[in-house]
């Protein structure tokens, strides 16, 4: 005997109480694949979470965090406070990146500037708390014989003292 349930499309469930008729998913539930015996309850975005995508009969809701926070964990299971660019979140709150490190996002940790000399290059643009250094041509390429529009920038940012 062919299983009639396999004919039930996404957005419906196979209702055993009604001779395996395909019934629409009830409100606040969904089935993303065909042949389902039940519909799943939708994820609810409330409190620190806001709805990024509404639930439909065929797809679950998706949550985001309220303003000033960003998602952490699987499927945004928690929200963490944002910091400014040039900062990182510590146990005591948002702290500026130490000299020689940067963070160009509102989340995550400060990372060391790229060491241009490891690639045999020179610093073209200084690093800041918010931006990594930009590496340019190697010092050999900037010898008196080579044409260069601008001289290499100094290694340290003027007036930028360690934190």
């Amino acid at each position: 005997l062919q299983d009639l349930c396999s004919n039930c499309p996404a957005g419906t469930f196979c209702d055993n109480n009604r001779s395996q008729i395909c019934s629409p998913c009830p409100p606040n539930s969904f089935s993303s694949a065909g042949g389902q015996r039940t519909c799943d309850i939708c994820r609810q975005c409330k409190g620190v979470f806001k709805t990024r995508k509404e639930c439909s009969s065929t797809s679950n809701a998706e949550c985001d965090c309220i303003s000033g926070y960003h998602c952490l964990g699987a499927e945004c299971s928690m929200c963490e406070q944002d910091c400014k660019q040039g900062q990182e979140l510590t146990k005591k709150g948002c702290k500026d990146c130490c000299f020689g490190t940067f963070n160009d996002q509102k989340r995550g940790i400060c990372r060391p500037w790229t060491n241009c000399s490891l690639d045999g290059k020179s610093v073209l643009v200084n690093g800041t708390k918010e931006r990594d250094v930009v590496c340019g041509p190697s010092p050999a390429d900037l010898s008196p014989g080579a044409s260069s529009a601008t001289p290499p920038a100094p290694a340290r940012e003027p007036g930028h003292s360690p934190q």
Partner: antibody, heavy 124, light 107 residues
Framework: QITLKESGPTLVKPTQTLTLTCTFS??????????VNWIRQPPGEALEWLAL???????YYSPSLKSRLTITKDTSKNQVVLTMTNMDPVDTATYYC????????????????WGQGTLVTVSS | DIQMTQSPSSLSASVGDRVTITCRAS??????LNWYQQKPGKAPKLLIY???SLQSGVPSRFSGSGSGTDFTLTISSLQPEDFATYYC?????????FGQGTKVEIK
């Protein structure tokens, strides 16, 4: 430090209305993302969630008890009030309020911390 | 409503034992699963949130794992103060629902 404390009658008669107050400190119910929940526990039984109110006045209720419950807040007094009508002996339980939202720099839909609870007995 | 089923409902163990409690959801709840500890006459206390994150101040012998429908709370080395009842709770949708509890008793 966040603390919550429940208060209200310890004994109510069947058919009466129960009014419980949760008085809290260490957070404000005007802060975005914050909520207060009510949860109960009959003697020797498991926990049952009842109701929730958020900073923005959004309210949520247990579907099975929705017709009997009302949750309100008084932000200036740092209080949340739960009323439950038509009390029955099966409503005998310890009633807890619990904070939900952001503590420190992290937030989610979990209950932390809880008040100490208040035992309500329904009997004639 | 989403049903949460804990097993076992009770267990006897000795100090130093490794204890595992399981919790199953009636449908997938991703990582929206929290664990609480309750001692007699006291309010529940949050141990683990978002399935595996240890709440501040909770000893590292407690750990949580799992996602979807199956979750586990593990106490790596049971201490005298750990004898209590443990509850799982889903925060995926309203109403939030709890497991029926697992009572950890002294052997």
């Amino acid at each position: 430090q966040i603390t919550l404390k429940e208060s209200g009658p310890t004994l109510v008669k069947p058919t009466q209305t129960l009014t419980l107050t949760c008085t809290f400190s260490g957070f404000s119910l005007s802060t975005t993302g914050v909520g207060v929940n009510w949860i109960r526990q009959p003697p020797g039984e498991a926990l049952e969630w009842l109701a929730l109110i958020y900073w923005n006045d959004d309210t949520y209720y247990s579907p099975s008890l929705k017709s009997r419950l009302t949750i309100t807040k008084d932000t200036s007094k740092n209080q949340v009030v739960l009323t439950m009508t038509n009390m029955d002996p099966v409503d005998t339980a310890t009633y807890y309020c619990a904070h939900e939202g952001i503590i420190g720099f992290l937030g989610g839909n979990w209950f932390d911390p809880w008040g100490q609870g208040t035992l309500v007995t329904v009997s004639s | 409503d989403i049903q949460m089923t804990q097993s076992p409902s009770s267990l006897s163990a000795s100090v130093g034992d490794r204890v595992t409690i399981t919790c199953r959801a009636s449908q997938s709840i991703s990582s929206y699963l929290n664990w609480y500890q309750q001692k007699p006459g006291k309010a529940p206390k949050l141990l683990i949130y978002a399935a595996s994150s240890l709440q501040s101040g909770v000893p590292s012998r407690f750990s949580g794992s799992g996602s979807g429908t199956d979750f586990t709370l593990t106490i790596s080395s049971l201490q005298p103060e750990d004898f209590a009842t443990y509850y799982c709770q889903q925060s995926y949708s309203t109403p939030p629902t709890f497991g029926q509890g697992t009572k950890v008793e002294i052997k």
